[in-house]
């Protein structure tokens, strides 16, 4: 790391170490040998998140509701607004600009993980033992039907799509 | 009281490595910078550099970059300056001192030493 | 860098004498200058600091002057605990930089 001129929370400005302005305020004026750097809060609209030297700050960020958003976290002088999507949506990139549909998993498919307002729907394949029959966005793969608990026999096998279908045993008079 | 007690004098061979640790008390160790300075025999005095023992932050001299590392241990409230590959022009008494408190200063860097410690000699011969 | 010249590089006066020493910086540093006090053996002493700010503890017999690039020291009566050699530190900037000190030796 290069040498710097002045100590942490400083900047170099006509030969002269100056303090930053605090998270939350802007720079209005460098300092001199007499003064203090000079710093005013950021409006009820704008923020700056780091120690800085900017004369303008950040607008917050605007949770557009046509794209699907809405405010997760209101913002404050010292941090942006956090959007998030509406119910069944999800943020299509990490800085959720705008919001898609959940996926749903197809027959075949249970949910694995349910989506989030940031991640979408995870699915995973139905193991041996497990079906699922709907497209949905919540359902887990579910076991097949034991047709022995219930006094009954399998007369037609399972497969990840359909339950197992159960009917009465054979039962041979002697 | 503020006292900075330093590690014993070294000897060491060239292109060796040498570790001074500079032990605080009496204040609050993450408060203050500390600063490394060298006085070689019969010279004048060498800034080398300082820690910020709160954040880790370090800034050192051109001359020493690459060679030198300052660290601390806040649990026990030391500092320790290391320079590798040493040399015969490195023979000096190194000093730990201490800075202005955080925040004392606004503009400047105003870094003024008002507790320093006793010196560590450090001999590099072969 | 900046550089810290300090004149003269030694003196010889006598206990009672005014004592004066500049400090001369390669440019401006405003009035981030510290003087320290060395005596032989040991780590040095600060004196005084943003050029006229005098130390807690340190004699009143101790003065410093000067702005910009231009800095003096002065003992305006030297006493024997004060021979020594004195050191300016500019504070304006990193790195830090020391002049090459003044020698008060007895006349």
């Known amino acids: 790391e290069p040498p710097t001129a002045c100590r942490e929370k400083q900047y170099l400005i006509n030969s002269q170490c100056c303090s930053l302005c605090q998270p939350g305020q802007k720079l209005v004026s460098d300092c001199t040998e007499f003064t203090e750097t000079e710093c005013l809060p950021c409006s009820e609209s704008e923020f700056l998140d780091t120690w800085n030297r900017e004369t303008r700050c950040h607008q917050h960020k605007y949770c557009d509701p046509n794209l699907g958003l809405r405010v997760q976290q209101k913002g404050t002088s010292e941090t942006d607004t956090i959007c998030t999507c509406e119910e069944g949506l999800h943020c299509m990139s990490e800085s959720c600009e705008s919001c898609v549909p959940h996926r749903s998993c197809l027959p075949g498919f249970g949910v694995k993980q349910i989506a989030t307002g940031v991640s979408d729907t995870i699915c995973e394949p139905c193991p041996v033992g497990f079906f699922s029959n709907v497209s949905s966005a919540f359902e887990k793969c579910r076991p097949w039907t034991s047709c022995e608990t219930k006094d009954l026999v399998v007369q037609q096998a399972g497969t990840n799509k359909t339950d197992v279908v159960c009917g009465p045993q054979d039962r041979q008079r002697a | 009281q503020v006292q900075l007690v330093q590690s014993g004098a070294e000897v060491k061979k060239p292109g060796a490595s040498v570790k001074v640790s500079c032990k605080a008390s009496?204040?609050?160790?993450?408060?203050?910078?500390m600063h490394w300075v060298r006085q070689a025999p019969g010279q004048g005095l060498e800034w080398m550099g300082w820690?910020?023992?709160?954040?880790?932050?370090?800034n050192y001299a051109q001359k020493f970059q690459g060679r030198v590392t300052m660290t601390r241990d806040t649990s026990i409230s030391t500092a320790y300056m290391e320079l590798n590959r040493l040399r015969s022009d490195d023979t000096a008494v190194y000093y730990c001192a201490r800075d202005q408190p955080l925040g004392y200063c606004t503009n400047g860097v105003c870094s003024y030493f008002d507790y320093w410690g006793q010196g560590t000699l450090v001999t590099v011969s072969s | 860098d900046i550089q810290m010249t300090q004149s003269p590089s030694s003196v010889s006066a006598s206990v009672g004498d005014r004592v004066t020493i500049t400090c001369r910086a390669s440019?401006?540093?405003?009035?981030?200058l510290a003087w320290y006090q060395q005596k032989p053996g040991k780590a040095p002493n600060l004196l005084i600091y943003?050029?006229?700010t005098l130390q807690s503890g340190v004699p009143s017999r101790f003065s410093g002057s000067g702005s910009g690039t231009d800095f003096t020291l002065t003992i305006s009566s030297l006493q024997p605990e004060d021979f020594a050699t004195y050191y300016c530190?500019?504070?304006?900037?990193?790195?830090?930089?020391f002049g090459g000190g003044t020698k008060v030796e007895i006349k």
């Open positions: 440019q401006g540093i405003y009035s981030w």
């Open positions: 820690i910020n023992p709160d954040s880790g932050g370090t």
């Open positions: 009496g204040y609050t160790f993450t408060g203050y910078y």
């Open positions: 943003t050029a006229s």
């Open positions: 530190q500019q504070a304006n900037i990193f790195p830090l930089t």
